[in-house]
C-alpha cells in the first residue's frame, strides 16, 4: 500500500481467482484513543472499533472511503483504491491502446517546436467518475523540472456504438534551450482513477522524436504564363522554432483530387515555393518536416487549384 | 592552435555541402546498424545516450545562433568568441561566426573519427564479420575536416591489447552512431545558419 495523495491510498493486488489479497491497517487521524468506530462509504454498518482497523482487501467491494467517527462526528477519511496486477502485468483497463506508433501505446505526445513545450493525449470510453493527474520530468534518476497543467477533456467522438473521449495535457520544460542536444528523455506519468480503480501510464521520449510542425501558412498560387504550371508559395508556421535558417524545414507539395486513389503531382523542396501542375477540381497541399531530423510531417495546408 | 586565414569562396558556403553529406552518411550507417544488429539493443529507446565529446568540446554553446543568446537556458557554459576563421568561411561572412564554433566542430569530428577507426579495427577481427563501418562515412568525416582546415594535434588511434568483446563493441557502435547523428544534425543546422548569414 502507498499514499497517492493526502488520505488516498493505493492497494496493489495480485488479481487471480481466490487470491489472498492484502492485509491493510488503517489508522484514524485523531488524538482520540477510544470510542472510535469505522464505516465504509455510505453504509452505516460498523466495521470495527478502535483507533486502527485491519482489513483484508481482495476485491473492489473492499475498496472505498473508510471513515472513522466518534459520537456521530467524522474524525478522518481514508480512500482505498485498487491497482490490479494480472499475470505480473499492471492492468490497463481505463485507457485505450492507440496502437500508434506501436502496440501498447496509451499516451501520445507531440511538440510543435523545440521550445520544450509539448502536448500529450489519451483516449478512453469511460465518461464518468474519472480523474487524471499528470507529472513529468527530464530524466528519472536526477529529474529536471517539467511543469504540466491539468488534464482536460479535449474531444468526443462516436466510434461505432461507443463514444470515445480524448483527454489532453500541456507541459513545459522549465529551462529548455531549443538548440540543446537531448541525452536524457522526458518522462511523462499519468495517474488514472476510475471509481475505485487506480492505474498508471508512462511515456518516455526525446522532444526531437515527437516534433510535428504546424502546417505551412499563407499558401498562395501564381499561374505561369503559357503553361499548365502554377507557382505555389507558402511561409513557415508561426509556431516553428527560430531562426528558420538554423531550424530549417523541408516541404512536400502535392496536387491531388478528392480521392487518394486519384493521380497526383508531387515534389519535395527545401524552399518556400514550388512549381506544380494544377488540375481542375484538384487542390494543392503543402506539409512540412524538420529538414535535418526526420520526425513527423505536419498536417497538410491546402488551397483549391481553381 | 593554428587558425588559417579565411579565403573568400565564391558561391555556396563550402562546408554546407559536406555537412549535408555527413548527416546523410551517418543516418545511413545508423539505419544499416539497426537492421544488421536487430537482435542487439540498438534503437534510440534501448541504448544509453552518451556523448564522447562531453566536457571536451562545446559545439552547441559555441555555435548557438545569435537569436538564441538571449535565452538564459542556452547560456549555461557559453564562452563565446565572435572572432572568426577557418577556410569554410568566405571573408565577407566572418563577422557572423566564431572561431570557437568551427574549431569545436573540427574537434568533434576528430574525436569521432578516432573512435570509429578504433572500433572498425575491432570489428574487422570479428569472425562473424557482421558489420563494418561504412568507408563513405569515414571519408565524409575526413572531407568536412579538410574543408574546416584547422590544424590540431593528431590524436593517436587507441590500440587495445586485450581480446575485443564483439558484443560490447557492437553496442558501443550503436551508442556512438546515435550520438554522432545528433551531433551531425547540430552541425548541419549550424552550417545552414552560417550559409544564410
Amino acid at each position: 500500500i502507498w499514499e497517492l495523495k493526502k488520505d488516498v491510498y493505493v492497494v496493489e493486488l495480485d488479481w487471480y481467482p481466490d487470491a489472498p489479497g492484502e492485509m491493510v491497517v488503517l489508522t484514524c487521524d485523531t488524538p482520540e484513543e477510544d470510542g472510535i468506530t469505522w464505516t465504509l462509504d455510505q453504509s452505516s454498518e460498523v466495521l470495527g472499533s478502535g483507533k486502527t482497523l485491519t482489513i483484508q482487501v481482495k476485491e473492489f467491494g473492499d475498496a472505498g472511503q473508510y471513515t472513522c467517527h466518534k459520537g456521530g462526528e467524522v474524525l478522518s477519511h481514508s480512500l482505498l483504491l485498487l491497482h490490479k496486477k494480472e499475470d505480473g502485468i499492471w492492468s490497463t483497463d481505463i485507457l485505450k491502446d492507440q496502437k500508434e506508433p506501436k502496440n501498447k501505446t496509451f499516451l501520445r505526445c507531440e511538440a510543435k517546436n523545440y521550445s520544450g513545450r509539448f502536448t500529450c493525449w489519451w483516449l478512453t470510453t469511460i465518461s464518468t467518475d474519472l480523474t487524471f493527474s499528470v507529472k513529468s520530468s527530464r530524466g528519472s534518476s536526477d529529474p529536471q523540472g517539467v511543469t504540466c497543467g491539468a488534464a482536460t477533456l479535449s474531444a468526443e467522438r462516436v466510434r461505432g456504438d461507443n463514444k470515445e473521449y480524448e483527454y489532453s495535457v500541456e507541459c513545459q520544460e522549465d529551462s529548455a534551450c531549443p538548440a540543446a542536444e537531448e541525452s536524457l528523455p522526458i518522462e511523462v506519468m499519468v495517474d488514472a482513477v476510475h471509481k475505485l480503480k487506480y492505474e498508471n501510464y508512462t511515456s518516455s521520449f526525446f522532444i526531437r522524436d515527437i516534433i510535428k510542425p504546424d502546417p505551412p501558412k499563407n499558401l498562395q498560387l501564381k499561374p505561369l504564363k503559357n503553361s499548365r504550371q502554377v507557382e505555389v508559395s507558402w511561409e513557415y508556421p508561426d509556431t516553428w522554432s527560430t531562426p528558420h535558417s538554423y531550424f530549417s524545414l523541408t516541404f512536400c507539395v502535392q496536387v491531388q483530387g478528392k480521392s487518394k486513389r486519384e493521380k497526383k503531382d508531387r515534389v519535395f523542396t527545401d524552399k518556400t515555393s514550388a512549381t506544380v501542375i494544377c488540375r481542375k477540381n484538384a487542390s494543392i497541399s503543402v506539409r512540412a518536416q524538420d529538414r535535418y531530423y526526420s520526425s513527423s510531417w505536419s498536417e497538410w495546408a491546402s488551397v483549391p487549384c481553381s | 592552435r593554428n587558425l588559417p586565414v579565411a579565403t573568400p569562396d565564391p558561391g555556396m558556403f563550402p562546408c554546407l555541402h559536406h555537412s549535408q553529406n555527413l548527416l546523410r552518411a551517418v543516418s545511413n550507417m545508423l539505419q544499416k546498424a539497426r537492421q544488421t544488429l536487430e537482435f542487439y539493443p540498438c534503437t534510440s529507446e534501448e541504448i544509453d545516450h552518451e556523448d564522447i565529446t562531453k566536457d571536451k568540446t562545446s559545439t552547441v554553446e559555441a555555435c548557438l545562433p545569435l537569436e538564441l543568446t538571449k535565452n538564459e537556458s542556452c547560456l549555461n557554459s557559453r564562452e563565446t568568441s565572435f572572432i572568426t576563421n577557418g577556410s569554410c568561411l568566405a571573408s565577407r561572412k566572418t563577422s557572423f561566426m566564431m572561431a570557437l564554433c568551427l574549431s569545436s566542430i573540427y574537434e568533434d569530428l576528430k574525436m569521432y573519427q578516432v573512435e570509429f577507426k578504433t572500433m572498425n579495427a575491432k570489428l574487422l577481427m570479428d569472425p562473424k564479420r557482421q558489420i563494418f563501418l561504412d568507408q563513405n562515412m569515414l571519408a565524409v568525416i575526413d572531407e568536412l575536416m579538410q574543408a574546416l582546415n584547422f590544424n590540431s594535434e593528431t590524436v593517436p588511434q587507441k590500440s587495445s591489447l586485450e581480446e575485443p568483446d564483439f558484443y560490447k563493441t557492437k553496442i558501443k557502435l550503436c551508442i556512438l552512431l546515435h550520438a554522432f547523428r545528433i551531433r551531425a544534425v547540430t552541425i548541419d543546422r549550424v552550417m545552414s545558419y552560417l550559409n544564410a548569414s
Partner: antibody, heavy 118, light 107 residues
Framework: QVQLVQSGAEVKKPGSSVKVSCKAS????????LHWVRQAPGQGQEWMGW????????EYAPKFQGRVTITADESTSTAYMELSSLRSEDTAVYYC???????????WGQGTLVTVSS | DIVMTQSPLSLPVTPGEPASISCRAS??????LHWYQQKPGQQPRLLIA???QSISGVPSRFSGSGSGTDFTLTISSLQPEDFATYYC?????????FGQGTKVEIK
C-alpha cells in the same frame, strides 16, 4: 496486371512523320498520366512529354516543342505520339510509360524502334 | 535544364559483392530522384522512388540514399540477374531528365 503494348517498328524517311501507339490494359486508362520517353542507340533516356487522358492536357519538353504531338483516345485506352520533321538523329526506341504520379514512371511499354534513314 | 551525371559509367563487380552507383544533379533537387534498371532489349523497371522509397516487388538488396545534389543507389549483394544498366531521373522540374546510365558488369 497493368500493361502497355506499343505498335511495331517503323522505318521512316527524313522529313516525314511517325505516329506510335500505346494501348493500356489493366486499371482505368484516365487514372494515369502517360509519358513518352525515347532512347537513342547506346544513349540514355530523353523525356518527350506527357498527357493526362482525362482532359487531354499535355506538356512537352522544350526540345520537342512544335514537333511532337501526344494524344489519347479514352474509348480505346490508347495513347499516341506523333513526331514530325524526322531527322536521322531521331532514330531511337520510343517508350510510353505511365504512373499515377506525374513525374516518374512505374510501368513502361516494350518500346518501339523508329529508324530514320534515307 | 537540370543535368544528371552518373558515375562510374561502367562498374565491374564480382557476384555476391556490393555495388554503389552515384548520381549528381547540376542543382539541388531535394529528394526528387528516382532509379531504374534496364536490361538489354527490355524496358526500364522502377527500383527506387524519391531517393530512398522502396518499390513493392523490388528486392530489399536495392536501396537508395541522398538528397540535394548527391545520390547513391546501393545493391548490397549483387545477384546474377542484377547485371544491367541503371539510370537516375530527376523530377524536381520539367523537363524531366535522366542520367546517362551506369552499366554494372560481371568482373
Amino acid at each position: 496486371q497493368v500493361q502497355l503494348v506499343q505498335s511495331g517498328a517503323e522505318v521512316k524517311k527524313p522529313g516525314s512523320s511517325v505516329k506510335v501507339s500505346c494501348k493500356a490494359s489493366g486499371g482505368t486508362f484516365s487514372d494515369y498520366y502517360l509519358h513518352w520517353v525515347r532512347q537513342a542507340p547506346g544513349q540514355g533516356q530523353e523525356w518527350m512529354g506527357w498527357i493526362d487522358p482525362e482532359n487531354g492536357d499535355t506538356e512537352y519538353a522544350p526540345k520537342f516543342q512544335g514537333r511532337v504531338t501526344i494524344t489519347a483516345d479514352e474509348s480505346t485506352s490508347t495513347a499516341y505520339m506523333e513526331l514530325s520533321s524526322l531527322r536521322s538523329e531521331d532514330t531511337a526506341v520510343y517508350y510510353c510509360a505511365r504512373n499515377k504520379e506525374l513525374r516518374y514512371f512505374d510501368v513502361w511499354g516494350q518500346g518501339t524502334l523508329v529508324t530514320v534513314s534515307s | 535544364d537540370i543535368v544528371m551525371t552518373q558515375s562510374p559509367l561502367s562498374l565491374p563487380v564480382t557476384p555476391g559483392e556490393p555495388a554503389s552507383i552515384s548520381c549528381r544533379a547540376s542543382q539541388s533537387i531535394s529528394i526528387n530522384l528516382h532509379w531504374y534498371q534496364q536490361k538489354p532489349g527490355q524496358q526500364p523497371r522502377l527500383l527506387i522512388a524519391f531517393a530512398s522509397q522502396s518499390i513493392s516487388g523490388v528486392p530489399s538488396r536495392f536501396s537508395g540514399s541522398g538528397s540535394g545534389t548527391d545520390f547513391t543507389l546501393t545493391i548490397s549483394s549483387l545477384q546474377p540477374e542484377d547485371f544491367a544498366t541503371y539510370y537516375c531521373q530527376q523530377s524536381n522540374s520539367f523537363p524531366l531528365t535522366f542520367g546517362q546510365g551506369t552499366k554494372v558488369e560481371i568482373k
